[in-house]
Each structure stands twice: as C-alpha cells, then as structure tokens.
Interface confidence: medium
C-alpha cells in the first residue's frame, strides 16, 4: 500500500459519494486507433480530441479521423468532424494551437497525391468553427504561429520553400527558397538557414544564416558557414564552420545577429554537438559532447553575454545528437536543475543544482528509506531520479519528473535509493521544500499530477492489467485515498489537465476491449467538491526557500536574494482556487564570492570560492573576441553570476580595455554583411 | 547560549497598557518566528500570536485582535508585546517563544526556547 | 478553533512506571505537534516536536507517536525529575492551540 494509506491519515469525509456525482464518462463511438488530446486556450474548459484510425489495404493506407470538442474541461464531448468536412487529418502535424489565448487552431489534411498542395482547416473562435484553405505548397511542418502576433504564421514546405501568411493561413506567400530551417524570434522577427548547392544535408556547415524583420519584404545574410543555429533567452547561437578543419564553434549574439561573439567553448568536431539545456534572458546552460562515441560531455554556464562560460558539470549524461539526456528544469524553486551523470564504471547517478548550475551534489537519500544493492555502504548513499534516459531504455518509469511554478517547492519523480540508478522496478519519490529532501510518496511506478497549485495530487498505478482506481491526496502526498471510478476496468493509457495546473479536473484515458472491438474511453473527475471551500489566510504558512541553516544570516540566499513564500498548509483541505497567485516576499543578500563567477582566464580550484588565473595564461595580457574586436581585458578575475541580485558586501571591480584589433573569426564581421530587398 | 530575557513584573489598572520586552541574544534574531504565550494563574497555556522579526508581518488569534501589537527592534535584537485596554482577567504570566526551524518552515515546530515569563497584575 | 484534549487531566505514578499521555484533536492536523513539560513557577520546555521527533537535549525515555488526530506522549521510566504538567500544542492551523494539560504526580 501507499505510504499513508492507514488508520493514522486524516479521511476526507465522504469523498466517494463526492467523487461519484463529478464523474463523467464519455466513450468514443471509434475503431481504437491514434488518440491525440489538445487545450485551447487558459481556462476556457475547451479540449480537442483526434482520433484517427489506419487500415493497411495492400496498394494504399485507408485512414479516418474524427474530431471532438470539449467545452467543460471533458465532461462532455461532441463530435464536429463535419465542421472538418469528415477529412482525414495529419496526425503527424498534431493540432497547432494558437499562442495565449487566441483562441486559433490549425489542422492539416491529408490529401490526394497528385494535388497541387496541402490543406488545412482554421478556426480562430476556439474551434467552434472551421474555415477549409487549400495551400499552394505541401507542408512539411506544423505551422508555426509567431509569438507576438496569431495571425502571423509560418511553414516549411517539402520543396524547401519558407512560407508566411499575414492573415492567419487564409493567403500565403513564398518568401524564400532553399530552407533549411526556420524559426520565429522576437518582435516577429524570422531566422533562418539556406544552403547555395545541393541540399540542406549536403550543404551542412556550409549554409547561411539570413533574418528578415518584415515578413520577407527585406533580407539580411547575418552567418555564413554555419552548421546550425539556435534560439534561448535572449541569445541567439549559432554552430560556425572552422576555416581551416572540420570542427566548429558556437558564436553568441544578443543583437538579433547585428553583431556576434565567440563563445568561450571548446570547438566541437564532426561526430560532436552542442546542446542549449536551458536558457532564459540572464544566462544559458550549454551541453558540449566529449570526442568519441561517449555518451556524455560537460555542462558549461554562460556570463550575461552568452560569451564567457563557467565548467558546471563534468560527465554529463547525454547519448547522442537530439539523443536522450536527463537535464531537467525544477519549474517550482528558483535555480533548480537536476540531471545525470555517467560515473567511470558506467553507472549512471543524479545531480542536483540548487544556485543555477554553481555546484552540483547528490540528493540527500529520503529518510525511513533503505539503500539498494547498488550501494556499497548500506547506511550511505543518495536519490536517483528517473528521467528522459530511463524512458528511452523501456525501464518500468511511466513518467518523467514534475514540478509546476505555481505548485511552490514540489517535485514528483521515480526513484530508486542507492549509489546509481537501479533497473530495478521503481518507487515514485516527493519533495516539498524543491529537491533538498525527499520522501517516499508511493510504492511502485506510477502516472501523477498536480491539481489545483498543488493542493492536490492525483496518481494511477502504472499497470499492464485494465485499471478502475484513482488515488489522490490532499496534504502533498503524505497520506492517499483510493477512489473506483469505474466498475469496469479501463486499459489505462494517460492522465490528461489542463496545462499550469490550476484545474481541479482530470481526464483518465484509456480503451475497452471487447470480443469483436476496442473504443476510446475518458473519465473526467472534477475534485471541487473535496476541496469544499475556498482557502483563506489561515490556510497558509510562511516558508523560505533554500533555507538549510537557520543560525545563518544568509539563510536562504540565492543568487543574491531570498524568496519567502506564502504556503499551503498540508492539513488544510480547501480550493487555492483558478487565481491563484504565488505570494512571495524577496530580501536581497549581501555580496559574496559565491555571487560572483570567475571572468575569462580564471577558475575556482575544487572547494574554494576564490578565483586563481589559470596557469598557462598567468602574466599574459587577456585577448578575447568580443563583437568581432579583439579585446584586453584587465579584471580581478570576477564577473557578477547572471540574475544575481546582491547588493554591498564582497565587490570586486572589473575593467575591459578595448584594443580594437579585428578578431580572426571567420564568421561575417558587421561591415561585410549584406542586405537586400524583395 | 541562546537565551530570551524579559522585563520585570508589571502592576496595572483596568484600561491600560502594559508593553512587555523580550530581548534575544546568542542566535540570529531575524531568522526565527517570535511567539507570545501567557498562562493565567493555576491555568493552562494560551497563544496569543507570532511576529516574523525579519519582515515584522504579524498574525495576532482572534481573541486579542483589535489589543495586542508585536513590534520589534532588529538593531537591539529585542521583541515586543504590547496589550491594551487591560481587564482584570488579563491577569497573567507572558512568555516570549522563540518558534523552532526546520528546512525552511517557520511554524509547526513548537517553540523551543522560552523568557522567564513577565508576571502582568491587573487590578484597580 | 482546534480543539485539543488532553487526557487524563491528572494521574499519579511512581518512579520507575510507564506513562502514556494522550492528546486528541477535534480536526486532522497531519503531524504538526508538539509536547511541552512545565514545572510549577517555570517557563515550559518543548520535549517532543512534529509529533515524534525528540527535540535535542531530552532525555530518550521521552517519545511521541501519532498522525492525523491522535497523538500520544509515553514516558518510558518515569524518573523524579518527570513530575511536572505535561501540554500538547498544536501548531499546523492558526490559532495555534494547547491542550487543557496533564499533571503527573507522586504516588
């Protein structure tokens, strides 16, 4: 049984007959094929369904589609397949929703081979309504909405072409031929790389990174020679081609690609990659794979430039180009990440950062647990989360880790307890203070998330039998009732909210299986009414995060600030409710070394704070490329830690003198670069 | 050592206001919740509300709302509670608390060092 | 408000006896209790806090045990020092709460 499931756990009074007038069934009147589920909109209630099923006829694949549409969060479903003219759409392409709350939806249609193009279906009053358009290009990408404007869409056709509607798909232009690849920036701003020859594969290394900030009225060629380029934060990065060998380096821009840096990263050769982990408008986590066929390589953290880089993690689990890595953004607590790492005997262990990637160290092993057999010293040893890379390798781990921003503190993820990972069947672990300590919260594998900003979190066990039992718990997985919601057991396969975990609504999935035929179910359960009442002040304590020494002044600094924040109360049984906002209070910190990064040409020896020069360049003049300049810098070796808010204390000062020499960079310096117009 | 010390025993009317000190020393001030607690003669113990020293945001139990106010002096490391409108039922010993830490969590850990207690005499 | 009670108001031991106190709340308050001793004219001592766990310097014959509603103190051994009156408090909900108190004294 569950952990909590026992005379000792608060009941929830009356919670089956309250569960059994909030449940709805609906059962889908198909063939069980493909089921694909989109929200429309925040807090709408609206949910697509598609589901398409494939017969394999011996010349040709006959395929059906049926679209549904929720508009009370899935109680109810309606079949509008007719607003879509019963055409068989795409699954491949899913549904493209609309930024925010636009209330746009875009399907793409399967259609006859000798057409002249694709077609798609659009809808802009939250799928109400449909509007049939035949493209004069066949798509061979999801449209893409621009993150400033719905009706601003782009799409990549099969011929290589990059096309752009200004009218949300009801008119569409080619702006450019021999695309590679495309993406929106901002202030609808679009980036894209061309190849001159033959194609996008053979051209690799060789393409040419253009912008236009006009919908393709005008163009400017902002890199050449690039291998491939990306967008984080407020950086865009691109993978450059050395002149004079085959290895390539990543160049940093903040200016939309008006002027570019070289990233202070190690080159990278053909069989290696560079990865963004992560990145927000501060700073950027980048992934850079070791030579040979490894399976990992080093994290490294980016200064407010994108330019100078810190070494953060070394053995950094990560198997191959667009391959399976385990890193993980711990949405609920400021500066959390977690990941993995591959150790010298080829286990594979977790890491936790809780100062955005500063230092990393084991999770702290959960308290009344006992350690595996992977471990060596049977009273010692850490947490291991199973993530990506489990999944990828079919171990018995439904699901990767999950925290929301508004659920403050709270991860859920399976875990084994040892010295590495266990390919044993997992349990499923919790921590409520964002990854400092941890609990076992069910015994077993199972699906999870979280309702209502974490007041409550529903589970399923994670079963190969059909399943009819839902567990939840409102008091943060400390105690789990058991709810049947079904008499006849469903083949169980995925748990659906509303994305941001504000709802008090889940939706289990699932098919029936009868002699002659199998049909898509959903159960939707509305968990208002054991959240009877809305929480109100006394509901909540205070908790300050990343507290882990009272006595300290400094308790609770991170990045130069501490956050206390409004809590629920894990006994209090009440609604935060759809406004819910996280109420937090932050106090800024006094400077120390430990907010500060080391500059270029500096590094912190192991368990010191101090930043030493690093010996070969000791009594050199620093030269770095800045901006296509070469540049002198004279610094104390300190550079303050992106997002870092600390004010007084420790102060070191830095000065960059600029020699304005050209750099030997291959890459476009700002004067060569051209423009032209359409 | 960590120690809460209050001020001496106060005699007071009917209508009054008696403010009580309770000045920490040996730990960091503003890092722990301060509690008041006060025990009638031959009675049990009764919470009259906490101050947050480091934001000196309060919450006061209904019963007292409206006459007590907890303050604090961060640079003096000293708390204060102040009861107005005195009756002779308020008649009582007060304590200082401090609320016990744990992993971040300000309440819920009862409070692990206590004042001396000031004697309050209400009488007319 | 909570409600805590207490029971037994009173009880007399002798030196060497096991004691149990228990302490019952009128709504779920998880783990959040806490167990004080107070000696006559004396500020109370915390003994136990979130329900089990023994605050430092406190004796092991002093343990707590409970979830939910119900909560108990036991005292292993009674010693002579361990006659005083003992309090639960609650402290997940505001207002924080005391039991009405437990005086153990000589048989």
């Known amino acids: 049984s569950a952990p909590g499931e026992d005379e000792e756990c608060g009941r929830v009074r009356d919670f089956v007959a309250k569960l059994a007038n909030n449940t709805h069934q609906h059962v889908f009147d198909d063939l069980r094929g493909s089921v694909s589920l989109s929200w429309v909109g925040d807090s709408t209630g609206v949910i697509l369904v598609l589901t398409t099923f494939h017969v394999p006829l011996v010349i040709m694949t006959f395929g059906q589609s049926k679209l549904y549409r929720s508009e009370d969060y899935g109680k109810n479903f309606k079949d509008i397949t007719d607003l879509i003219n019963n055409t068989f759409i795409r699954t491949e392409f899913g549904m493209a929703i609309g930024p925010e709350n636009s209330g746009k939806v875009v399907l793409t249609a399967e259609v006859s081979g000798g057409s002249r193009g694709g077609r798609i279906f659009r809808s802009s009053d939250f799928a109400k309504n449909f509007v049939q358009t035949d493209l004069p290009f066949h798509p061979l990408t999801q449209m893409m909405y621009s993150p400033q404007n719905s009706d601003y869409l782009l799409a990549l056709s099969t011929e290589n072409g990059l096309w752009v509607s200004k009218n949300f798909g009801g008119k569409w232009e080619e702006i450019h031929k021999a695309v590679c690849l495309a993406k929106w920036g901002s202030d609808n701003t679009i980036f894209f790389t061309t190849y001159a020859n033959g194609s996008c594969k053979a051209d690799l290394g060789a393409l040419e990174l253009w912008r236009t900030s006009d919908l393709g009225k005008s163009f400017k060629t902002i890199g050449v020679k690039i291998y491939s380029f990306g967008l984080g934060g407020r950086f865009l990065f691109a993978s450059v081609m050395a002149d004079k060998d085959t290895t390539r380096r990543i160049h940093v821009s903040t200016d939309q690609g008006d002027t570019w840096s070289m990233a202070q990263l190690p080159s990278v050769g053909q069989e290696q990659f560079y990865s963004i982990l992560a990145a927000n408008d501060d700073m950027v986590f980048m992934h850079v794979d070791e030579p040979g066929d490894t399976g990992f390589g080093t994290i490294f953290t980016s200064d407010d430039r994108g330019i100078v880089y810190s070494k953060s993690l070394d053995r950094h689990l990560y198997t191959t180009t667009g391959g399976e890595t385990d890193f993980t953004n711990v949405t609920s607590l400021r500066g959390v990440y977690i990941t993995s790492v591959l150790s010298e005997d080829n286990s594979i262990q977790t890491m936790i950062t809780f100062d955005q990637g500063g230092r990393w160290t084991h999770l702290r092993k959960p308290e009344n647990s006992e350690c595996d057999a992977t471990a060596k010293n049977k009273n010692e040893c850490s947490l291991h989360i199973h993530a990506s890379y489990s999944i990828s390798q079919k171990l018995n781990v439904p699901m990767a880790p999950l925290s929301e921003p508004n659920a403050v503190g709270i991860v859920i993820a399976h875990g084994s307890v040892g010295d590495a990972i266990s390919v044993m069947v997992p349990d499923v672990y919790i921590s409520d203070d964002g990854g400092y300590s941890w609990t076992k919260m069910l015994e077993g594998p199972h699906y999870y998330t979280i309702l209502d900003s974490g007041g409550i979190i529903v589970a399923i066990e994670h079963s190969s039998r059909p399943i009819n039992v839902i567990k939840f718990s409102t008091d943060e997985g400390q105690c789990w009732q058991t709810y049947t919601f079904t008499r006849d057991p469903i083949y169980f396969t995925g748990l659906a909210s509303e994305p941001g975990a504000r709802s008090m609504n889940i939706s289990i999935w699932g098919f029936t299986e009868s002699f002659l035929t199998s049909q898509w179910v959903s159960y939707t359960i509305d968990f208002k009414d054991i959240l009877e009442r809305n929480c109100e002040e006394k509901d909540y304590t205070i908790w300050l995060a990343h507290s882990t020494d009272p006595e300290d002044y400094e308790d609770g600094c991170i990045l130069g600030y501490k956050e206390q924040f409004l809590r629920l109360r894990k006994s209090s049984v009440c609604q935060n409710g759809r406004d819910y906002v996280v109420t937090k209070q932050p106090s800024i910190c006094l400077c120390s070394l430990e907010d500060f990064l080391c500059d270029f040409g500096y590094y912190r020896p192991e368990n010191d704070s101090k930043c030493v020069e690093q010996p070969e360049l000791k009594g050199h003049d620093l030269e770095f490329c800045l901006y296509g300049r070469e540049e002198h810098l004279t610094t104390n070796g300190y550079r303050k830690i992106p997002g870092d808010k600390c004010q007084g204390g420790v102060n070191p000062v830095r000065e960059v003198k600029d020699l304005k020499k050209k750099c030997t960079s291959n890459f476009l310096s700002p004067e060569k670069q051209n423009s032209k117009s359409n | 050592q960590v120690q809460l010390v209050q001020s001496g025993a106060e005699v007071k009317k009917p209508g009054a206001s008696v403010k009580v000190s309770c000045k920490a020393s040996?730990?960091?001030?503003?890092?722990?919740?301060m509690h008041w607690v006060r025990q009638a003669p031959g009675q049990g113990l009764e919470w009259m509300g906490w101050?947050?020293?480091?934001?000196?945001?309060?919450r006061y139990a209904q019963k007292f709302q409206g006459r007590v106010t907890m303050t604090r002096d961060t640079s003096i490391s000293t708390a204060y509670m102040e009861l107005s409108r005195l009756r002779s039922d308020d008649t009582a010993v007060y304590y200082c608390?401090?609320?016990?830490?744990?992993?971040?969590?300000?309440?819920?850990?009862?409070?692990?060092?206590w004042g001396q207690g000031t004697t309050v005499t209400v009488s007319s | 408000d909570i409600q805590m009670t207490q029971s037994p108001s009173s009880l007399s031991a002798s030196v060497g006896d096991r004691v149990t106190i228990t302490c019952r709340a009128s709504q779920s308050i998880s783990s959040y209790l806490n167990w004080y001793q107070q000696k006559p004219g004396k500020a109370p001592k915390l003994l136990i806090y979130?329900?089990?766990s023994l605050q430092s310097g406190v004796p092991s014959r002093f343990s707590g045990s409970g979830s939910g509603t119900d909560f108990t103190l036991t005292i292993s051994s009674l010693q002579p020092e361990d006659f005083a009156t003992y309090y639960c408090?609650?402290?997940?909900?505001?207002?924080?709460?005391f039991g009405g108190g437990t005086k153990v004294e000589i048989k």
């Open positions: 608390a401090r609320g016990k830490r744990s992993s971040g969590w300000y309440e819920g850990y009862g409070m692990d060092v």
């Open positions: 040996g730990y960091t001030f503003v890092a722990y919740y």
């Open positions: 408090q609650q402290s997940d909900v505001s207002p924080i709460t």
């Open positions: 101050i947050n020293p480091n934001s000196g945001a309060t």
């Open positions: 979130a329900a089990s």
